[in-house]
Interface confidence: medium
């Protein structure tokens, strides 16, 4: 989650928080994560940390859905303190907001080493396939916050560990884009509650993982249909009539193009879109807003003010995506411009560090796409051609010298405009 900085408040998941304000983050598909506390610090940074639970000195500690740590029965809060979030009904059982439970039969492709973990959040049931670690003991035990059984003493799976061999299954690498992380930046190997992080950070790529690969978290959203009348489905505040299809818009990830939901009477059914392994062309290309790659020749979704004669080509020249990231911290602005190329398949990242208008540092990194997809804050800004990129880099060399000795206000922003391709008029290429 990109955090915007300001003297008086913090921005987190499109919500404003006052300095000193504390909250539990809302993470799809788990809902409110009570075991993480976030605070808005004075410098506008959001700091999140895992709740450390004290040892409880009783034989049967009780788990309360809206509290992270187990409590002894005699120290429970009075009933009227109960959080008044919407409960969920699933298979005839009512679950409180924040409650985790196990479901059977939701996923046809469930592997023997997987179980279905569900959680109730704001009246919706979120379920995911969780791949369980191989057990090395004869008598595994059940734990309250996981559908996987564990060996005694192994129950604590913390975000601080960075050895992700259990939960980070790489089967469909397209789907392994990290979602934009806040400042606690848990390693990609462990996620909230031990479930793999929901994929699809940058919506122009990535998808839910292929359930046949038995990896990642395959999410099935079962809407609580109580109080809903008529043949409609409600998703993300929008109403859909029976038979209508849409791409879900998940709070932390934006629109997930690789999932298609259909309204079936009053129940939304969501399916992963399967992209072909092979394409009839040599270099199929990714279009923003589309799940699968498209062969040149099929009309592209145009970026504002740009015209491509066929997919990915501008005036006969191949185009490549350009990403931008601007991050401000402690009066320093780090601006990154990244060009993704297919031959060689890498991402060229140009990094500018500016303090009080003076260029402090400029360097270029060539990184793998895998590494790029794990970097937060990047947004697709345009597509450009190699010739425009060459003009950009030449201009960049000039202003990198110029701006290291005098204050520059808009030079870099102006230079970035070179990368935007003008709408072509016939015969004016």
């Amino acid at each position: 989650e990109q955090v915007k900085h300001s003297e008086t408040y913090c921005m987190f998941q499109d919500k404003k928080y006052r300095v000193g304000e504390r909250w539990h983050p809302y993470l799809e598909p788990y809902g409110l994560v009570y075991c993480v506390n976030c605070i808005c610090s004075e410098n506008g940074n959001v700091l999140c940390s895992r709740v450390r639970c004290p040892n409880v000195h009783c034989l049967s500690p009780v788990h309360i859905p809206h509290l992270c740590c187990p409590r002894c029965p005699d120290s429970l809060p009075p009933v009227n303190n109960k959080v008044t979030s919407k409960s969920c009904e699933y298979n005839g059982t009512t679950y409180q907001h924040g409650e985790l439970f196990v479901a059977e039969g939701l996923f046809q492709n469930r592997q023997p080493n997987q179980c279905t973990q569900c959680s109730c959040s704001e009246g919706n049931v979120y379920c995911g396939l969780k791949t369980c670690p191989k057990l090395t003991c004869a008598f595994p035990v059940s734990v309250p916050d996981s559908c996987c059984r564990v060996c005694r003493g192994d129950g604590e799976l913390s975000w601080e560990h960075s050895d992700g061999d259990i939960f980070r299954q790489p089967a469909n690498r397209e789907a392994r884009h990290s979602y934009h992380r806040s400042h606690y930046d848990p390693p990609p190997s462990r996620q909230a509650g031990g479930l793999s992080r929901f994929p699809g950070a940058r919506s122009h790529r990535g998808a839910l993982m292929d359930s046949q690969q038995a990896s990642g978290t395959i999410v099935q959203i079962v809407i609580n249909n109580k109080h809903k009348h008529g043949q409609v489905c409600v998703s993300n505040g929008k109403t859909y009539s029976h038979g209508e299809s849409w791409h879900p818009n998940l709070r932390a990830f934006g629109i997930v193009e690789c999932v298609l939901c259909t309204c079936n009477v009053t129940k939304q059914e969501c399916k992963k879109i399967h992209c072909p392994n092979r394409y009839p062309c040599k270099y199929p290309q990714k279009i923003d807003g589309k799940c699968c790659k498209v062969c040149p020749g099929k009309k592209a979704k145009e970026l504002p003010g740009q015209s491509f004669d066929n997919k990915g080509y501008f005036c006969g020249e191949e185009t490549m995506p350009v990403y931008e990231s601007v991050f401000m911290e402690d009066g320093e602005t780090t601006r990154k411009i990244a060009l993704e190329t297919e031959r060689p398949p890498q991402v060229e990242v140009h990094v500018w560090t500016i303090r009080k208008g003076i260029l402090q540092h400029f360097h270029i990194e060539k990184i793998s796409k895998r590494m790029f997809e794990e970097l937060p804050h990047f947004k697709l800004v345009t597509r450009t051609t190699l010739s425009q990129w060459k003009i950009f880099t030449e201009g960049e060399a000039q202003i990198s010298q110029m701006c290291s000795s005098r204050v520059c206000r808009t030079e870099l922003e102006d230079l970035v405009k070179v990368l935007y391709l003008e709408r072509s008029e016939k015969g004016h290429c």
Partner: antibody, heavy 121, light 108 residues
Framework: EVQLQQSGPELVKPGASVKISCKAS????????MNWVKQSPEKSLEWIGE????????TYNQKFKAKATLTVDKSSSTAYMQLKSLTSEDSAVFYC??????????????WGTGTTVTVSS | EIVLTQSPALMAASPGEKVTITCSVT???????LHWYQQKSQTSPKPWIY???NLASGVPVRFSGSGSGTSYSLIISSMEAEDAATYYC?????????FGAGTKLELK
């Protein structure tokens, strides 16, 4: 030219530890995952684990979790692997290997020169 | 973990002969996640074929790869002396990443 230069051969006593290095050159070190692979006559090639040089985040093969520790030094573009409590079964050639990392293909596109570790009393 | 079984373990081929090395996988994997490496004595492995059928840089066109699901092959259309080496298949479909035991190809 992209190169991974590994440290020289090691002769160590059982129970001891050893730390081998892999110096990267010719590319952005923090831009590609680094993997470690063990090659022994009995077991052929075995993947030990990977490290993200940018964050230091690691993923291990469960089998080597208690045996190997992967680290990096970004300033010198060097990856390290420490092996502890060595036994004769740990005698092998160890390779570092770069993850090509460009979807949809993920494979080891550049391999290190290899470090031979011999455990003997 | 996914186990890769290569066959044959050892084989000899004459110059000009067609060679096929197979790699059998214990569970279905996507073809983009199956790779082949070549290793000659006393040297490091080299990427040879990636994503089932794509030749790595500098690999002669007499090499090809095919397969899907659980069965994959490396093919040499016409054996040459420089092809004598050990070939390993490897999967990158799920952790831990695993390799086949290798096929040693000798020149007859």
């Amino acid at each position: 030219e992209v190169q991974l230069q590994q440290s020289g051969p090691e002769l160590v006593k059982p129970g001891a530890s050893v730390k081998i290095s892999c110096k990267a050159s010719g590319y952005t070190f923090t831009g590609y995952y680094m993997n470690w692979v063990k090659q022994s006559p009995e077991k052929s090639l075995e993947w030990i684990g990977e490290i993200n040089p940018r964050t230091g985040g690691t993923t291990y093969n469960q089998k080597f979790k208690a045996k190997a520790t992967l680290t990096v030094d970004k300033s010198s573009s060097t990856a390290y692997m420490q092996l502890k409590s060595l036994t004769s079964e740990d005698s092998a050639v160890f390779y570092c290997a770069r993850d090509y990392g460009s979807s949809p293909y993920w494979y080891f596109d550049v391999w290190g020169t290899g470090t031979t570790v011999t455990v003997s009393s | 973990e996914i186990v890769l079984t290569q066959s044959p373990a050892l084989m000899a081929a004459s110059p000009g002969e067609k060679v096929t090395i197979t790699c059998s996988v214990t569970s279905n994997i996507t073809s983009s996640n199956l790779h082949w490496y070549q290793q000659k004595s006393q040297t490091s492995p080299k990427p040879w074929i990636y994503g089932t059928s794509n030749l790595a840089s500098g690999v002669p066109v007499r090499f090809s790869g095919s397969g899907s699901g659980t069965s994959y092959s490396l093919i040499i259309s016409s054996m040459e002396a420089e092809d004598a080496a050990t070939y390993y298949c490897q999967q990158w479909s799920s952790y831990p990443l695993t390799f086949g035991a290798g096929t040693k190809l000798e020149l007859k």
